[in-house]
């Protein structure tokens, strides 16, 4: 069945922690992605940004998780109003920012 929101959030946090702790060389060869507004529709917005990174084994599981948690189909090159379209950041920074926000949501019990 569908993954409960609290479980989904916890699993995603664990995976992002794993990425940040195991990072040796520049994550995804220093690829840049659009920054996002960490508000409503965050899973889809994060996927829309990270899906434009290809060939990066370190974030494949994160992409899978976000794809499963986002209720609509997302393709590379697709953008929504949830992106801060004038700001690109490294994937490593994107992951750190997302992790901090997700941890905050988890502490506050905001699972959806």
């Amino acid at each position: 069945g569908p993954v409960p929101p609290s479980t989904a959030l916890r699993e995603l946090i664990e995976e992002l922690v794993n990425i940040t702790q195991n990072q040796k060389a520049p994550l995804c060869n220093g690829s840049m992605v659009w920054s996002i507004n960490l508000t409503a529709g965050m899973y889809c917005a994060a996927l829309e940004s990270l899906i434009n990174v290809s060939g990066c084994s370190a974030i494949e599981k994160t992409q899978r998780m976000l794809s499963g948690f986002c209720p609509h189909k997302v393709s590379a090159g697709q953008f929504s109003s949830l992106h801060v379209r004038d700001t690109k950041i490294e994937v490593a920074q994107f992951v750190k920012d997302l992790l901090l926000h997700l941890k905050k949501l988890f502490r506050e019990g905001q699972f959806n």
Partner: antibody, heavy 118, light 111 residues
């Protein structure tokens, strides 16, 4: 335009080694993954292994001990090396690029034919 | 490794009729709500061509007569109506685990 082209020796002796190069254009090997797939004459496709854009390498379990995949991103080349060749390694060898997530193989080379025979 | 078994090994379908090809996986290829199963078409003397990804999504430029369905271990590729240019061998492929695998292929002949 995305293109992949394999180049190999054509004929290899049993017990020998095989080296195939995949030269790509239209995209960068630093942010795309390349798969190696082979097809014996009249038979189906067999996935051999892949090298990710970030350098991770995955191999098919059955061939792991005989295979080596590497790349030179600056030259846009990916290399497949196979040791201890047998006659049943005779096949057309393809390189294929992974697209974006979910990483299906969206562009393929035309393949290079390799015959293992004395 | 996940073993993919395709059936039938070959089939002949009349022009304009429906062709159905099955692919069964030895274990689930589902992960976080998606099925990591893809379908390829290979015509004689050519490399394979991606048709469908994630079980049911049509690759850009592929005609709408091709469709895919299924989840977990059972998947189907449907061509309806079959055209003369669809004569080819069709392969399923999974990438739910690090070691990817292909099915044995199904050869489609048009009557």
């Amino acid at each position: 335009e995305v293109q992949l082209k394999e180049s190999g020796p054509g004929l290899v002796a049993p017990g020998g080694s095989l080296s195939i190069t995949c030269t790509v254009s239209g995209f960068s090997l630093t942010d795309s993954s390349i798969n190696w797939v082979r097809q014996p004459p009249g038979k189906g496709l067999e996935w051999l292994g892949m090298i990710w854009g970030d350098g991770r390498i995955d191999y098919a379990d059955a061939l792991k001990s005989r295979l080596s995949i590497s790349k030179d991103s600056s030259k846009s080349q990916v290399f497949l090396e196979m040791t201890s060749l047998r006659t049943d390694d005779t096949a057309t060898y393809y390189c294929a690029r992974d697209g974006y997530f979910p990483y299906a193989m969206d562009f393929w080379g035309q393949g290079t034919s390799v015959t293992v025979s004395s | 490794d996940i073993v993919l078994t395709q059936s039938p090994a070959s089939l002949a379908v009349s022009l304009g009729q429906r062709a159905t090809i099955s692919c069964r996986a030895s274990e689930s290829v589902d992960s976080y709500g998606n099925s990591y199963m893809h379908w390829y078409q290979q015509k004689a003397g050519q490399p394979p061509k991606l048709l469908i990804y994630l079980a049911s999504n049509l690759e850009s430029g592929v005609p709408a007569r091709f469709s895919g369905s299924g989840s977990r271990t059972d998947f189907t590729l449907t061509i309806d109506p079959v055209q003369a240019e669809d004569a080819a061998t069709y392969y399923c492929q999974q990438n739910n685990e690090d070691s990817r695998t292909f099915g044995g292929g199904t050869k489609l002949e048009i009557k």
